[in-house]
Amino acid sequence: SNNSFTNFKLATELPAWSKLQKIYESQGKTLSVKQEFQKDAKRFEKLNKTFTNYDGSKILFDYSKNLVNDEIIAALIELAKEANVTGLRDAMFKGEHINSTEDRAVYHVALRNRANKPMYVDGVNVAPEVDSVLKHMKEFSEQVRSGEWKGYTGKKITDVVNIGIGGSDLGPVMVTEALKHYAGVLDVHFVSNIDGTHIAETLKVVDPETTLFLIASKTFTTAETITNANTAKNWFLSKTGNDPSHIAKHFAALSTNETEVAKFGIDTKNMFGFESWVGGRYSVWSAIGLSVALYIGYDNFEAFLKGAEAVDNHFTQTPLEDNIPLLGGLLSVWYNNFFGAQTHLVAPFDQYLHRFPAYLQQLSMESNGKSVTRGNVFTDYSTGSILFGEPATNAQHSFFQLVHQGTKLIPSDFILAAQSHNPIENKLHQKMLASNFFAQAEALMVGKDEEQVKAEGATGGLVPHKVFSGNRPTTSILAQKITPATLGALIAYYEHVTFTEGAIWNINSFDQWGVELGKVLAKVIGKELDNSSTISTHDASTNGLINQFKEWM
């Protein structure tokens, strides 16, 4: 594959990499954050960065509780320069084909170009086309929300069912949950899993006369989505006198494949397209976000886009030392490759963000779960972290034990909005939530040594059980409020963190060949499940499982 974007094969070849290994040995692994605060009265001032959104709202990113000092930050920035992160970034923003294995541009950033500046792919300005799809989404969502768009019996639409998987599901699910406060007249449901339970349970609660189905599939060939879509269509027809003409009022497609959409029976006027330069996991900004626009209203959807656009502007225009996503990505590389950390925890102290870690899991792990560099050689270093998380304070009662006292380093991001959408009981709940947000980060940093434990009255064999090492790194992300603009900014922040990691590891963060093999084998096995014969074509384990399944099915 053609790769003209980087001039190194492996990150380990870069001089700053060796420098960082030495710094890790001499000071990184033994660094005491508590002592760093004592040594440098300006540490917080230097290591917290405030992002100002397009609407003037702010998000504070506090990196000061991380295992870094001035020298380490300087060496990490040197690494970013040597890896030419800014060069790759600029190539992405210019619409160049940085997805080298599929020879495609990576241009999700063009979807939130609300300034409507010219953005080119292969010599074509895509801004007008993006704008035209957004206008179509605005028009359609406003018609449906206002009741002007009616179902086949003349009733208003009350429910929207989005059928998609992966990028065509996770984004809209997460965003609609996160922005539930902004919901209006419609209920929205999401069907993703091929497990029949998912569609069956959804169809139990909706009315064919007032339901709009959105079939979300870039290719319109995704097995799970098309199977679920056909099931929905069959259910709809069976409830509506088997009249295919009714489909037009109740089915829309979010896809790039006009032929397949028409073949399915959807009027292509109700098709919302997007381009091949939009990757699935980056597609919530595109027509795939139609369910979001329907749920929270187009104006809020646009604010969501503008929040992301503001982070894009920050990422492209801010010097490296103050570049918030770049610093986030560099810290991730620091922990992953020098401390041997294998995971990254994202804990939103916000119930509305309960699907945010799942969304980031796909963003990060599908992007950077790669072993081959842009130079077509296998890496000799660790790449993509295992990202996980749950909302706090729930998480404090499950896996935080391991974060505090386990034998693994788990760099963590804590997210809180200062203003709750539900400031009930005179803000009592919000204050309790916030106190935990501050306390957890502090506890992970300061720990508790043997002397303190003994001073608190513990004796004998109990003492070591109550000791906390401290120096467990956290980044605290404090927003003013979770608004559409804030959420857009947070997602774009993590997109560019992921980009930065991938650029330093010199991997292609924009393909996903790893999902192919299982899909191919599933097709083969699917045919074998259609007959009653005993299967012997696989390994003994797979044969045994298939045959037992067939016996029990």
Partner: nanobody
Framework: QVQLVESGGGLVQPGGSLRLSCAAS????????MAWYRQAPGKQRELVAV???????NYADSVSGRFTISRDNAKNTVYLQMNSLKPEDTAVYYC????????????????WGQGTQVTVSS
């Protein structure tokens, strides 16, 4: 890498004294327990004395009252003052340290020195 280097061994007459020292070098966060072990020819290695980071000490019955273990945390060094030496104290003396490698981790790794020979003979 962590290195432990012992010194101070040698030949001494019964009733005499020796002071062994062991210095830890390399990159680590801190040292938890530091200890001295010994191994006489044809015998198992046995614990002689141990000193915790808090300064608390423990001795084998055979050396109690004659040997004193101490440490200098600033120098990452442990000492063994051996008085009233007996022929049965003849052995190779090994320094052992339980080291906390990283600031964030409580897990201790075990490190040994190469050993220093102590011979008590007239």
């Amino acid at each position: 890498q962590v290195q432990l280097v012992e010194s101070g061994g040698g030949l001494v007459q019964p009733g005499g004294s020796l002071r062994l020292s062991c210095a830890a070098s390399g990159s680590f966060f801190n040292i938890n327990a530091m200890a001295w072990y010994r191994q006489a020819p044809g015998k198992q290695r046995e614990l002689v004395a141990v000193i915790a980071s808090s300064g608390r000490t423990n001795y084998a019955d055979s050396v109690s009252g004659r040997f004193t273990i101490s440490r200098d945390n600033a120098k990452n060094t442990v000492y063994l003052q051996m008085n009233s030496l007996k022929p049965e104290d003849t052995a190779v003396y090994y320094c052992n340290s339980k080291i906390r490698q990283a600031s964030w981790n409580l897990v201790l790794s075990d490190h040994w020195g190469q050993g220093t020979q102590v011979t008590v003979s007239s």
